[in-house]
């Protein structure tokens, strides 16, 4: 189970001194900023017990690993249920503190219930302030049942649950009727998964037989201590004032664990710490009781004496929970409760016994969880004790489970259990991804997603070139951080793979999909200059450049001419992918516009220095559109246009041009230059008869205006074919022939 | 469907007995506390009888107390009532209801009747 | 037992009116108060619980208010359907009382 614990400090004369804390002693727990580890949280939950809102609670981490609730400023804040998440991925878990009002009108007589898979259980609400009314039940915040007052037996309501389920599992409070919710008795139901003694998906394996109230869970076969013992079966008890999967946290405050309540992953829930019991857990236990709540007997046997935090403390000569074992019946020594191992490896596991006989190396064997015995293959005898080692053949996931070291002699018999946790090393599941590159180097990101079990200790980052066989190069870096890939050859793909490793021995994995690398191309080093330019139109500019010698061949593939607009603030660019060109003609250039023109080699992505810049001045755009655009047929073959000159020209107008096509025609139109300016009609010959045309024209400046509208006319029927359009003018406002 | 389904009612001469009974479905039966309601021909509603879940506790209307028994059997989601010693003034409709508790706006219970069965008519008449 | 006190005992009004039917109890019962309607021929049917608490599935036309003795179920705006009887139900004890009933009647 993950080592988590929520605290709830119950001295309750001011409430604005009562805190939460949750605890972790999960390795890198709640570092929350990095991949590995998800941050501790602590709240309020407000989804089944509501309470008037109040001021925002405080929440303060004390470093990495310890997360403090506080302000608490009226006693009802302190009302209702509380909340603490730790583990990362499928080790997440929830631990629940529920708070009950000392001064409701009901209390549980105790608030967490853990019951099996099929168990009856009661809750039972003492009347504290006694109201005539009804008493309802609810179960996470939905009516669940009703009792009358007068049905209250010995001053409790009682809820009976027969058969209860997992989905039973839950928040129930008694409330009566007329009273305010906060006056209400909470409880907590945890209903574990199986029935009594057993664990897995169908139930079929057995508990470890956890001692001191400890609590197995259904999923794992894991003892859940509780505070103030360790072992794989609780059967240690830590010093006073210690707490945590390893005892290694230490109550707060000069009276040790006095008024504190400890809340840990189900299927526990909630106790006082060991040696204190009572509803705010400021009692001691009374004598020859112990544990948490006080609610183990110590039954001392052999002269033994009963201490309230750890139970039996044995003279010498005798050992065991009540002292009732001799020392001259062997014991196993010193045994961890829980060893890891990485997957196919094959460890030593030493077991150590003592007793009178003492063990030998025949005497002491090891049983898998499959019921497989292994012998010691050598043994370590020294005056105090006998350690046996054995070697253990290459594991497998089924191995994981609880095993057993024994030891037999003529004195009797010893047995450890002990949990043993086989983790497959990480896989990653992605390739690095690539940040950067340049030309000698790639900066790579190592950090992905992995398959199989963290932490993760060490990440090796592994490339070559691609299509290489020579050795891969090896970079062992910080899984955090990203990595610079240093002296690469330039242009260059690079098969890179992360390989990730865990603790232990055989803890690394298998390599990572490789993914492919491309280092960038050199530089180009070379500057072009602008040998000249000129305009060919309105919006079309020639740019010639050149290059200086250097031996060797050149590096480039192309060049980029770059046009700045600075008066609309707009860049244009001009790819020419040829290193060996001098010359681009731009067209499609903005007319009348000032434009800063430059030149720069560039190698796949990267770009050569500029050439100094040009200052270019484009003429103006041509002139507007002539205006009142008409046609008349006058024969078979020969159409008039008259129009009228454009308006607002921004000088004299060089020519007219007249487009002819055939109405619905598919063949190119045909362009007629009309080169006196001055006229305003023109007669277009040499047409087909019958045949309907479109016009359209449109005047010359320096560069060619906008056109026309486009009129439609058909010449007069019964002619004979054309040669094609011919073209004759006249200025209609002197009506002279042409 | 949630339903209340009474049946039973029917004429009877005064100081005669009558059964009703009320069948329930759609519901968890056994966790609601039930009441039987009378309505004289014409008349309003009047409160008869009521019965907790456990049917450990019962309350009657003065106008009854001493000759109606209510009564459930949770196993068979059935309400009954034991009508002895009638009068005239029994003649009505009797209405089995189902009372639920719910939350106010300010978090606490309020209570009420908010399920019906059709009724059952009682005639007590010589 | 607590004494329900309902008025008026009928009312005529039309579609569209706003309509107002007091209930006063004989002693406190905060807002333990209940309204129902019943048609002709039909079980009772809850509208409103703990005094102005509105049931799932009942128009928003109907609305309740008062604390103490003094409550009042309102229809803002009247609607065929709402032609029936309405009574007025104390929770606040065991003995669970109800009004005489107020009928409203089309006019």
């Known amino acids: 189970a993950v080592d988590l614990t929520l605290l709830a400090n119950l001295r309750l004369t001011d409430p604005q001194r009562f805190f939460l804390t949750c605890v972790s002693g999960e390795a890198g727990a709640g570092r929350g900023s990095d991949a590995w580890g998800p941050p501790l949280l602590l709240e309020k939950d407000d989804r089944i017990v509501r309470t008037p809102p109040g001021p925002p609670l405080r929440l303060a981490r004390n470093g990495s690993h310890q997360v403090t609730l506080r302000g608490f400023s009226k006693p009802s804040d302190l009302v209702g249920v509380f909340s603490c998440v730790g583990g990362a991925g499928a080790r997440r878990t929830r631990v629940i503190y529920v708070h009950n009002s000392p001064g409701a009108h009901l209390l549980p007589d105790k608030v967490t219930h853990t019951v099996n898979k099929g168990d009856t259980a009661v809750l039972s609400a003492r009347v504290h302030k006694e109201k005539q009314t009804d008493v309802i039940w609810k179960s996470n915040g939905s009516y669940f049942y009703t009792l009358d007052w007068h049905e209250a037996q010995d001053g409790r309501f009682l809820l009976q649950l027969p058969n209860v389920q997992p989905p039973s599992s839950g928040i129930y409070s008694a409330t009566y009727l007329e009273a305010s919710p906060l006056g209400s008795a909470f409880f907590r139901l945890i209903v574990r998964g199986c029935g009594a003694g057993r664990w897995g998906p169908g139930c079929t394996k057995e508990c470890p037989g956890c001692l001191h109230g400890g609590v197995c869970h259904d999923h794992d076969g894991e003892c859940v201590c509780p505070p103030g013992f360790t072992g794989t079966r609780c059967e240690q008890a830590c010093r006073e004032g210690r707490f945590g999967q390893s005892c290694q946290e230490q109550c707060p405050g000069i009276s040790g664990c006095r008024g504190l309540t400890f809340c840990l992953p189900d299927p526990y829930g909630c106790s006082c710490g060991s040696g204190w019991r009572g509803s705010q857990c400021q009692e001691a236990c009374a004598p020859g009781h112990f544990g948490a709540d006080c609610r183990l007997q110590c039954q001392c046997q052999n002269g033994g004496t009963c201490d309230r935090f750890s139970g039996c403390v044995c003279p010498s000569g005798w050992h065991g929970v009540h002292c009732e074992k001799s020392d001259r019946i062997p014991q196993i020594l010193n045994m961890a409760s829980e060893l890891e191992f990485n997957l196919e490896t094959m460890p030593r596991i030493n077991c150590a016994a003592a007793g009178n006989p003492f063990p030998v190396r025949g005497s002491i064997e090891l049983r898998k969880p499959d019921g497989t015995v292994l012998l010691s293959t050598k043994a370590i005898v020294e005056p105090e004790k006998t350690t046996a080692e054995f070697e253990v053949p290459r594991l497998v996931l089924a191995d994981s489970g609880f095993w057993e070291c024994r030891v037999s002699t003529s004195g009797g018999q010893d047995s450890r259990r002990f949990k043993v946790n086989v983790k497959v090393p990480p896989v990653p599941l992605a390739a690095p991804r690539l940040l950067t590159k340049q030309s000698r180097q790639l900066v790579v990101s190592p950090l992905v997603s992995f398959s199989g079990d963290g932490p993760i200790s060490t990440v090796r980052l592994h490339y070559r070139p691609q299509d290489s066989t020579m050795d891969w190069s090896t970079i062992v870096v910080d899984p955090s951080e990203n990595v610079t890939l240093m002296n690469l050859r330039p242009k260059t793909g690079y098969s890179v793979r992360v390989q990730l490793s865990r603790p232990g021995e055989g803890g690394e994995g298998a390599w990572g999909p490789p993914t492919l690398m491309t280092t960038d191309c050199p530089e180009p080093l070379l500057q072009p200059w602008l040998e000249g330019w000129h305009v060919e139109g309105t919006d079309r500019l020639r740019v010639s450049w050149s290059l200086p010698l250097v031996p060797g061949p050149l590096v480039g593939d192309g060049f980029l001419l770059r046009l700045w607009d600075g008066t609309r603030g707009q860049e244009r660019r001009e790819n020419v992918s040829s290193p060996q060109a001098r010359t681009a003609l731009l067209t499609g250039l903005t007319p009348g516009t000032h434009y800063q023109l430059d030149v720069q080699l560039y190698h796949c992505t990267l770009l050569g220095p500029a050439s100094p810049p040009a200052h270019v001045l484009l003429p103006p755009s041509g002139p507007p559109a002539p205006r009142h655009l008409h046609a008349q047929a006058l024969s078979d073959s020969e159409i008039q246009l008259t129009w009228k000159h454009p308006e607002a020209l921004p000088g004299p107008i060089s020519k007219y041009v007249v487009e002819v096509q055939v109405a619905g025609g598919a063949g190119d139109p045909l362009w007629i230059d009309v080169d006196r300016p001055e006229e305003t009609s023109t007669i277009i010959r040499g047409l087909n008869a019958s045949t309907r045309y479109l016009f359209r024209m449109r005047a010359s400046i320096q560069g060619l205006g906008d056109w026309s509208n486009t009129v439609e006319e058909s010449t007069l029927g019964n002619g004979l074919q054309a040669e094609g359009p011919v073209q004759e003018s006249r200025a209609a406002e002197e009506g002279l022939d042409q | 469907e949630v339903q209340l389904l009474e049946s039973g009612g029917g004429l009877v001469q005064p100081g005669g007995s009558l059964r009703l009974s009320c069948a329930a479905s759609?519901?968890?039966?056994?966790?609601?506390?039930m009441q039987w309601v009378r309505q004289a021909p014409g008349k309003g509603l009047e409160w008869v009888s009521s019965?907790?879940?456990?049917?450990?506790?019962?309350y009657y209307a003065d106008s009854v107390k001493g000759r109606f028994t209510i009564s459930r059997d949770n196993s068979k989601n059935t309400l009954y009532l034991q009508m002895n010693s009638l009068r005239a003034e029994d003649t009505a409709v009797y209405y089995c209801?189902?009372?639920?508790?719910?939350?106010?706006?300010?978090?606490?219970?309020?209570?009420?009747?908010?399920?019906w069965g059709q009724g059952t008519m009682v005639t007590v008449s010589s | 037992d607590i004494q329900m006190t309902q008025s008026p005992s009928s009312l005529s009004a039309s579609i569209g009116d706003r309509v107002t039917v007091t209930c006063r109890t004989s002693?406190?019962?905060?807002?333990?108060l209940n309204w129902y309607q019943q048609k002709p021929g039909q079980a009772p049917n809850l509208l409103i619980y703990?005094?102005?608490s509105l049931e799932s599935g009942v128009p928003s036309r109907f609305s309740g208010s008062g604390s103490g003795t003094d409550f009042t179920l309102t229809i803002s705006s009247l609607q065929p359907e709402d032609f029936a009887t309405y009574y007025c139900?104390?929770?606040?004890?065991?003995?669970?009382?109800f009004g005489r009933g107020t009928t409203l009647e089309i006019q």
């Open positions: 209801a189902r009372q639920t508790y719910y939350y106010d706006s300010s978090g606490y219970f309020r209570n009420a009747f908010d399920i």
């Open positions: 759609g519901f968890t039966f056994s966790i609601y506390k």
């Open positions: 019965i907790y879940p456990s049917g450990g506790a019962t």
């Open positions: 002693q406190s019962i905060d807002t333990y």
């Open positions: 703990g005094a102005s």
């Open positions: 139900q104390q929770s606040y004890t065991t003995s669970y009382t």
